[in-house]
């Protein structure tokens, strides 16, 4: 192990830290309206928050880097909140043979962690 | 597909968007130097740099999620720069037997992306 | 909250046509696609077909390919379906139900509407 | 088209019995099963979505697992209430079907 341990308890407030939020999205926001039917309103979970040092550190590099922002905060950037997991979901699509059912498998996180 | 294709050329100029840099940091700077034992200076890849739209993205949602932050910037985030693989590296360690070789598969970034 | 109101029951005589309604509210009638499911008596669920109310494309089961037609009213937020050259064995209760969602969940269902088919 | 196979086609319990019931799927379809429950003279009601998710205000004593090809809807104390049919239904792809139907009984 790397003998530093990611923290879960936010030290910046409560919904502060790298947390995930839905979002809510129509096709038209996201471009897709001409070839994505339905639905057409999207329940989109995100990423967003801070990630303060060692919170929810995703691995070793994840630790190290948040290690040597404190040291070099000009030249190693801090972690960020970024998807760990996705959930699935479908959409219905415009075809040229018509209308088909297709799975997005990295449309909508499920997790958060700071990489 | 998602439609909104992932772009590799940097609009920001060179070395502005996300990309892999070499940052040198001691045994000392990681707070390791009491139980690894070798190298004392290790060469970490790390990803930094700027996301902008559609630069490197991971995935369908880090598109979607720079489309959004176009539209609602405060309330989501843009893609930032995280490592998209790794590269393992070896380090001496100091165990209660005496010294040891162990493997770290996620301390050194290999590849970036914006997540 | 989210309902789905069916019209009445119909009685026909075979080869004539019926026409069934479901009308939305509680949610806006055009962010999601209606499907139509029967179901004859004493018998399991069938998938008719599917209509997105925004935009009017349509998939119908292939059985049914030519003798249905599925319509929507965006004004009224209403959905229709009407089935042609009635056979007796279309009879049967029809149910609209609102889904896929992004989740493939069809979580809504009318009422249903008894459709007899007899000479 | 896809057949959704379900067994057993009825099964015969008591109150607070736990209760399976299983469907494949001829192909995978990923997790895109759902369950409902239908009592006589009335409309399916959904129970589980994307094969575990429990529909809002369905009781926890429901749970649904399985992907791929073979899944499980479990009722673990069944009630007097619970007394229906069950059916499964993939939407991995058009046409959507439907499995036969379970009829759960009283003992």
């Known amino acids: 192990s790397a003998h530093l341990h990611p923290r879960d308890s936010c030290p910046l407030g409560p919904g502060r830290c790298c947390h995930l939020e839905t979002v809510q999205a129509t096709l038209e926001d996201l471009g897709w309206s001409d070839w994505v039917l339905s639905p057409r309103q999207l329940q989109l979970s995100m990423c967003v928050g801070e990630c303060p040092h060692l919170y929810r550190s995703a691995n070793t590099h994840a630790l190290i880097k948040a290690r040597l922002h404190g040291l070099q905060p000009d030249r190693v950037p801090a972690p960020c909140c970024v998807p760990s997991s996705y959930t699935p979901v479908v959409l219905m699509h415009r075809t040229d043979s018509g209308v088909s059912l297709q799975t997005y498998d990295d449309l909508v996180a499920q997790g958060c962690h700071c990489a | 597909s998602a439609h909104l294709h992932p772009r590799d050329s940097c609009p920001l100029g060179p070395g502005r968007c996300c990309h892999l840099e070499t940052v040198q940091a001691t045994l000392e700077d990681l707070g390791w130097s009491d139980w690894v034992l070798s190298p004392r200076q290790l060469q970490l890849s790390m990803c930094v740099g700027e996301c902008p739209h559609l630069y490197r993205s991971a995935n369908t949602h880090a598109l979607i999620k720079a489309r959004l932050h176009g539209l609602q910037p405060d309330r989501v985030p843009a893609p930032c720069c995280v490592p998209s693989s790794y590269t393992p590296v070896v380090l001496m360690h100091r165990t209660d037997s005496g010294v040891s070789l162990q493997t770290y598969d996620d301390l050194v970034a290999q590849g970036c992306h914006c997540a | 909250q989210v309902q789905l109101v069916q019209s009445g029951a119909e009685v026909k005589k075979p080869g004539a046509s019926v026409k069934v309604s479901c009308k939305a509210s509680?949610?806006?009638?055009?962010?999601?696609?209606i499907n139509w499911v029967r179901q004859a008596p004493g018998q399991g669920l069938e998938w008719m077909g599917w209509i997105t109310a925004y935009s009017g494309d349509t998939v119908y089961a292939q059985k049914l390919q030519g003798r249905v037609t599925m319509t929507t009213d965006t004004s009224t937020s209403t959905a229709y379906m009407e089935l042609r050259s009635l056979r007796s064995d279309d009879t049967a209760v029809y149910y609209c139900?609102?889904?896929?969602?992004?989740?493939?969940?069809?979580?809504?269902w009318g009422q249903g509407t008894m459709v007899t088919v007899s000479s | 088209d896809i057949q959704m196979t379900q067994s057993p086609s009825s099964v015969s319990a008591s109150v607070g019995d736990r209760v399976t019931i299983t469907c494949r799927a001829s192909q995978g379809i990923s997790s895109w099963l759902a369950w409902y429950q239908q009592k006589p003279g009335k409309a399916p009601k959904l129970l589980i979505y994307?094969?575990?998710s429990l529909q809002s205000g369905v009781p926890s004593r429901f749970s649904g697992s399985g992907s791929g090809t073979d899944f499980t809807l479990t009722i673990s104390s069944l009630q007097p209430e619970d007394f229906a049919t069950y059916y499964c239904q993939q939407a991995n792809s058009f046409p959507i079907t439907f499995g036969g139907g379970t009829k759960v009984e009283i003992k």
């Open positions: 994307a094969a575990s």
């Open positions: 139900a609102r889904g896929p969602g992004q989740y493939a969940d069809v979580d809504v």
């Open positions: 509680g949610y806006t009638f055009t962010d999601e696609g």
